[in-house]
């Protein structure tokens, strides 16, 4: 039993850091592996994740972290059983995926103007809570070429448009998701989608 | 240049308390308490991490001992409970950049357990 792509994993920078790797063939994760993760900090002790399969030969083992700080750096093993497969480390601040933004919302009842406002996925203690920049991605369900995509790079976790940028009469659907500068994240996940139907008065045309 | 100052030490009886107390200047990712008692190896005993949230402890004080800092002062404490005879030591509060702890030390402070 080998290892053929080597573990790589992406913290949440909040709770959990997820670590996926390929085996050299088809691998029942949970009962053969077992990835043991360690905090480099003096007292410290070991921690076991239990794999989850993620496609044939693919695992995936989620780590549980009481928190995130910018200095934190952990140990990896991975075992087989009494054999060290892989030995590596992992500097949560260095790999972030921000978590997912929720309760995405379109309020329609400002005059022809729609609000959309979303939920920071980070309690206010936690670094990234003022470090989030935003992407709203906007597609109408009728028309696959009615796509955009507005970026949101003020902290307020919102975004206005006047309702008369988008076509009258059909339905839309937004989503957003985040990421944050200051450590070069990757975009978290979308959140899910949310749908309305878009309607405003046509302005009065004078001849 | 950093500066550790301990406070709180003295003689206590089996089965009392004592708050150990830790000035420093400056904030550390590091924060913990050493012992070392005569004739033996320093040893840790507590760590902290930044933050205040992920505490660490030696088996041998777990569930007497408890580790916290103060960030608005940054102050370091030990509340050391049920003591006993073994706990007789000079503790050091140390403070560190990484986890290993032990960049600057402060002078140490006494407790001694006796009836």
């Known amino acids: 039993m080998k290892v053929l792509q080597e573990p790589t994993c992406v913290s949440d920078y909040m709770s959990i850091s997820t670590c996926e790797w390929k085996m050299n063939g088809p691998t029942n994760c949970s009962t053969e592996l077992r990835l043991l993760y360690q905090l480099v900090f003096l007292l410290s002790e070991a921690h076991t994740c239990i794999p989850e399969n993620n496609g044939g030969a693919g695992c995936v083992c989620h780590l549980l972290m009481d928190d995130v700080v910018s200095a934190d750096n952990y140990t990896l093993d991975l075992w087989a059983g009494q054999q060290l497969l892989w030995k590596g480390s992992f500097k949560p601040s260095e790999h972030v995926k921000p978590r997912a933004p929720g309760n995405l919302t379109v309020h329609t009842n400002v005059s022809d103007t729609l609000l959309l406002t979303w939920s920071n996925p980070y309690p206010p203690d936690n670094y990234l809570y003022n470090h989030l920049t935003y992407a709203v991605n906007i597609w109408s369900e009728n028309d696959p070429a009615d796509f955009r995509i507005y970026n949101v790079t003020y902290l307020e976790p919102s975004l206005r448009i006047a309702a008369s940028t988008l076509k009258s009469g059909i339905s839309y659907r937004a989503r957003v998701r985040a990421w944050a500068q200051c450590y070069n994240t990757t975009w978290s996940e979308w959140s899910p989608s949310t749908k309305w139907h878009n309607s405003y008065r046509e302005p009065f045309e004078q001849h | 240049q950093v500066q550790l100052v301990e406070s709180g030490g003295g003689l206590v009886q089996p089965g009392g308390s004592l708050r150990l107390s830790c000035a420093a200047s400056?904030?550390?990712?590091?924060m913990a308490w050493f012992r070392q008692a005569p004739g033996k190896e320093r040893e840790a005993v507590a760590t902290?991490?930044?933050?205040?949230?992920?505490?660490y402890y030696a088996d041998s004080v777990k569930g007497r001992f408890t580790i916290s800092r103060d960030n608005s002062k940054n102050t370091l404490y030990l509340q050391m409970n049920s003591l006993k005879a073994e706990d007789t030591a000079v503790y050091y509060c140390?403070?560190?950049?990484?986890?290993?702890?032990?960049?600057?030390w402060g002078q140490g402070t006494l407790v001694t357990v006796s009836s």
């Open positions: 902290i991490r930044s933050g205040g949230r992920s505490t």
């Open positions: 140390a403070v560190g950049v990484d986890g290993n702890c032990r960049n600057y």
């Open positions: 400056g904030d550390f990712y590091c």
